[in-house]
């Protein structure tokens, strides 16, 4: 699986999850997020050669097409597969609000 | 929606579905597929600017991060959203087989 356990431990050129820390205030300008100050959102990148964690029959066929026809511009792309939520604390006036934001952290990638 | 109805009628630089015809014999070497001779598999391509058909909270946040930090290499990618099957005819010996292959035709795209 192209997950954090594998990808963060290996120098992997092809499609894999990469670490990306986002500071809410500095990177997004979100001063309103009280906690956490930032989080590892991570992202997916790297080429998707034939059969690399193909998501659908289309991505397998497209990967094969791209391999057999290298001049082609069409190829699968490395995108998130499994995502996890992030819990944040913010204030509405003086009232603290705890909210779970879905699909905020990339845990693994696929070729789609 | 970034579907064939919209994308095939507009000169759209950003993420959209693009026409791609695959000839089974010429492009894949699949002489064994009797019918059809080929099909429009299509593919997704184009930049994913902030809020362009974002698939998840992560892709929205990543699109915003990428817009505010243009030097960043992390950005969402344009990938298939809706796919349709393709029915093919092939032979096992002299016995014809009709089979529906799932997820073979891209009908729309998203930024993931």
């Amino acid at each position: 699986a192209l997950d954090t356990n594998y990808c963060f431990r290996n120098l992997e050129e092809n499609c894999c999850v990469r670490p990306l820390y986002i500071d809410f205030r500095q990177d997004l300008g979100w001063k309103w997020v009280h906690e956490p100050k930032g989080y590892y959102a991570n992202f997916c990148s790297g080429p998707c050669p034939y059969l690399r964690s193909a998501d659908t029959t289309h991505s397998t066929v497209l990967g094969l097409y791209n391999t057999l026809n290298p001049e082609a511009s069409a190829s699968p792309c490395c995108v998130p597969q499994d995502l996890e939520p992030l819990t944040i604390l913010y204030y509405v006036g003086r009232t603290p609000k705890v909210e779970q934001l879905s699909n905020m952290v990339v845990k693994s990638c696929k070729c789609s | 929606a970034l579907d064939t109805n919209y994308c095939f009628r507009n000169l759209e630089e950003n993420c959209c579905v693009r026409p791609l015809y695959i000839d089974f014999r010429q492009d894949l070497g699949w002489k064994w597929v009797h019918e059809p001779k080929g099909y429009y598999a299509n593919f997704c391509s184009g930049p994913c600017p902030y809020l362009r058909s974002a698939d998840t909270t992560h892709s929205t946040v990543l699109g915003l991060y990428n817009t505010l930090n243009p030097e960043a290499s992390a950005s969402p990618c344009c990938v298939p959203q809706d796919l349709e099957p393709l029915t093919i005819l092939y032979y096992v010996g002299r016995t014809p087989k009709v089979e529906q292959l799932s997820n073979m035709v891209v009908k729309s795209c998203k930024c993931s």
Epitope: T57, T60, V61, L64, L68 | G29, W30, Y90, K97, L101
Partner: nanobody, 118 residues
Framework: EVQVVESGGGLVQPGGSLRLSCAAS????????MGWFRQAPGKQRELVAI??????TYADSVKGRFTISRDNAKNTVYLQMDTLKPEDTAVYFC?????????????WGQGTQVTVSS
């Protein structure tokens, strides 16, 4: 279940030759996409060559030295490796991608070791 079995690996001197064989289940071989991949220690698995019907392609690093061929009567795909170099040392894996039928999917062999050393 599709069976994929490699053979033919071994120790060879630089400049030498080896021929790897990969047998796959007869019921799916004729429409399978057959591929050879390799994985060197500490490196990622990489594509070496593909035979897709009557189309074939090679990794740049082996072009002109390796030849993939298939014998549909024997349900076997071969990888003829000539002018071998030390950097060709790796475990070589055969893959069968079956696009149709009840066995649809991709299947891997266990791998065969190729060592190029003097």
């Amino acid at each position: 279940e599709v069976q994929v079995v490699e053979s033919g690996g071994g120790l060879v001197q630089p400049g030498g030759s080896l021929r790897l064989s990969c047998a796959a289940s007869a019921s799916v071989f004729s429409w399978s996409v057959m591929g050879w991949f390799r994985q060197a220690p500490g490196k990622q698995r990489e594509l070496v060559a593909i035979s897709s019907g009557d189309r074939e392609t090679y990794a740049d690093s082996v072009k002109g030295r390796f030849t993939i061929s298939r014998d549909n009567a024997k349900n076997t795909v071969y990888l003829q490796m000539d002018t071998l170099k030390p950097e060709d040392t790796a475990v070589y894996f055969c893959n069968a991608y079956v696009p149709v039928g009840e066995s649809r999917g991709d299947y891997w062999g266990q791998g065969t070791q190729v060592t190029v050393s003097s």
